[in-house]
């Protein structure tokens, strides 16, 4: 009962990572989070 | 064995505050993502607050605001401060443990809930 | 937000029975080549149970007489073989986005 992280993202294309509750779509490289995305593969809001 | 124990329901005014805390034993809670869910008697369930084992929070509009979920790993516990209640809020409110096989919310372990009644 | 609707909202079945509880979402829940629906249990006084999740897949310790189907906006929950252990609430829930909504439960009562 240990735990892990969740299993790695099953979303098309690259980038995607489990932020927040879901797996999300990360931000470009010059860019920081500023929230996570609310659905399955979703984007992030990046700034 | 997974156990989640919630504590601090009761009896409070509307308007007023109170706070409502889970323990959790019985796995790595800092890998868990946690929310509150809660059944007013007779009806159906509301999802409350997340918290996600990356430190993110999440809440439903109804509550947005006036609650505040937070947690504390060094003593595996959840936390859910509620200002501002209203009659509304009645209900008895669960901890609940997200499936650690999922890359989406579904709740996979339970605890037995505390009854919050908010009435004058 | 996804608006989750049960039916029937109760039935009368009796051991044996092979039961039928359906979910309609407002919108599509299925996405990304999942459907994220999912079902619980629960029984008078007690905390929820995890059956089913995405839509067909069997929670570990769950009766294998418990099964799930559906996408889109309609979901079924099935009991082959309905046993007295089985009488209780079932609820859906999604997970297609935030918030998460359940439907409004369907109660299973003796006969």
């Known amino acids: 009962q240990g735990g892990t992280r969740s299993p790695r993202c099953d979303c098309a294309g690259d980038f995607h990572k489990k932020i927040g509750l879901f797996c999300c779509r990360g931000c470009p490289a010059g860019h920081y989070l500023k929230a996570p995305c609310t659905e399955p593969c979703g984007n992030s809001t990046c700034l | 064995e997974v156990q989640l124990v919630e504590s601090g329901g009761g009896l409070v005014q509307p308007g007023g505050s109170l706070r409502l805390s889970c323990a959790a034993s019985?796995?790595?809670?800092?890998?868990?993502?946690m929310s509150w869910v809660r059944q007013a008697t007779g009806k159906g369930l509301e999802w409350v607050a997340a918290f996600s084992s990356d430190g993110y929070t999440f809440y439903p509009g109804s509550v947005k605001g006036r609650f505040t979920i937070s947690r504390e790993n060094a003593k595996n516990s959840l936390y859910l401060q509620m200002n501002s209640l209203r009659a509304g809020d009645t209900a008895v409110y669960y901890c609940?443990?997200?499936?650690?096989?999922?890359?989406?919310?579904?709740?996979?372990?339970w605890g037995q809930g505390t009854l919050v009644t908010v009435s004058s | 937000d996804i608006q989750m609707t049960q039916s029937p909202s109760s039935l009368s079945a009796s051991v044996g029975d092979r039961v039928t509880i359906t979910c309609r979402a407002s919108?599509?829940?299925?996405?990304?080549?999942?459907?994220?629906m999912h079902w619980y249990q629960q029984k008078p006084g007690k905390a929820p149970k995890l059956l089913i999740y995405?839509?067909?897949n069997l929670e570990s310790g769950v009766p294998s007489r418990f099964s799930g189907s559906g996408s889109g906006t309609d979901f079924t929950l099935t009991i082959s073989s309905l046993q007295p252990e089985d009488f209780a609430t079932y609820y859906c829930q999604h997970s297609r986005e935030l918030p998460l909504t359940f439907g409004g439960g369907t109660k299973v009562e003796i006969k």
């Open positions: 019985g796995f790595t809670f800092s890998n868990y993502d």
């Open positions: 995405l839509a067909s």
């Open positions: 919108k599509s829940v299925s996405t990304s080549g999942y459907s994220y």
């Open positions: 609940a443990r997200h499936a650690d096989y999922a890359n989406y919310p579904v709740m996979d372990y």
